[in-house]
């Protein structure tokens, strides 16, 4: 089975760890695919190790373990993320994470101060 935090949040400009945990008494992991919606983020395989898709190579760092660290987050990164575990002989298991990227606290504070500042 796949165990993961269903919903996570992080600040714009910050980073977040995407993590799925696979547990099985018999099956061994042979490959893990990570996707942002339908777009490939990175792949790990026992044979080849990690490959980060070129589109994300400046913002995605493999690990910890079979997870990913996603850096320099933008509001556009809000959405669904999927891990797909290819196992032998168990088959394919999928996990889903929803990431909400929020405005940084600095931005929120700045906006609040601006809104409450007296005119003139």
């Amino acid at each position: 089975t796949i165990d993961t935090k269903r919903n996570i949040s992080a600040e714009e400009g910050g980073s977040v760890i995407l993590q799925c945990h696979f547990s099985s008494d018999t099956a061994e992991v042979t490959q893990v695919d990570w996707k942002q919606q339908d777009q490939l983020l990175a792949i790990y395989s026992v044979d080849l190790g990690w490959h980060v898709a070129s589109v994300f190579s400046d913002r995605v760092v493999p690990g910890p373990s079979l997870g990913l660290t996603f850096q320099s987050l933008t509001m556009n990164d809000t959405g669904e993320y999927f891990c797909t575990y290819h196992t032998y002989p168990g088959g394919i298991y999928k996990g889903r994470i929803f990431l909400k990227v929020q405005e940084s606290s600095d931005d929120r504070n700045g906006l609040a101060q601006f809104q409450t500042a007296p005119l003139g």
Epitope: Q31, D33, D38, L40, S45, D47, L48
Partner: antibody
């Protein structure tokens, strides 16, 4: 530098057999799935067969199933395609290709021409 | 089997033109879509993998987009060495299948 070098092509009569080889160098051959793809003269690309890194799993196009056998010898860094009961429609340039993560074909050999004709 | 339909089958363009080639899958293939360039007498060369990732060493004028069933290869400014035939290919399931190709010719 990654290199794939096919050999074994040639002229064969219908019903005959050929064995193609693909010698790999410049990478850890035993870590990659390998595929064969063919291209008939003046036509597009057609996938033929695939084999996983360990050789434990293979798959074939319906058009060659039961006639062609893909295999590999990781100790020799070599991929093979045994072609039996050849038909005129098997005439093509045959390419071997490296396939990381079973996803994309990132390096191809130069191809070897197989001509099936009486 | 998943059918891959490419359009147009051929096009004429000039150096400097922006060229767009489309590929449609007969069912959803997520982002399991790759693009290749082939010149006469040569083996295909990988340009774009996973729908939008540029293969190492490929010029940045090539880009890919799309997911599901509809995909696009764009050459932002056509160069003399780009006149060739381009193929899309799905790796969502076996048998792997290729589009019929798009031949880019000099106008």
């Amino acid at each position: 530098e990654v290199q794939l070098l096919e050999s074994g092509g040639g002229l064969v009569q219908p019903g005959g057999s050929l064995r193609l080889s693909c010698a790999a160098s410049g990478f850890t051959f035993s870590s990659y799935s390998m595929h064969w793809v063919r291209q008939a003269p003046g036509k597009g690309l057609e996938w033929v067969a695939a084999i996983k890194s360990s050789g434990s799993s293979t798959s074939y196009a319906d058009s060659v199933k039961g006639r062609f056998t893909i295999s590999r010898d990781n100790s020799k860094n070599t991929l093979y395609l045994q072609m039996n009961s050849l038909r005129a429609e098997d005439t093509a340039v045959y390419y071997c290709a490296r396939v990381p993560y079973d996803y994309w074909l990132d390096y191809w050999g130069q191809g070897t021409l197989v001509t099936v004709s009486s | 089997d998943i059918q891959m339909t490419q359009s147009p089958s051929s096009l004429s363009a000039s150096v400097g033109d922006r060229v767009t080639i489309t590929c449609r899958a007969s069912q959803s293939i997520s982002s399991y879509l790759n693009w290749y360039q082939q010149k006469p007498g040569k083996a295909p060369k990988l340009l774009i993998y996973a729908a939008s990732s540029l293969q190492s060493g490929v010029p940045s004028r090539f880009s890919g987009s799309g997911s599901g069933t509809d995909f696009t290869l764009t050459i932002s400014s056509l160069q003399p060495e780009d006149f060739a035939t381009y193929y899309c290919q799905q790796s969502y399931s076996t048998p792997l299948t290729f589009g019929g190709g798009t031949k880019v010719e000099i106008k």
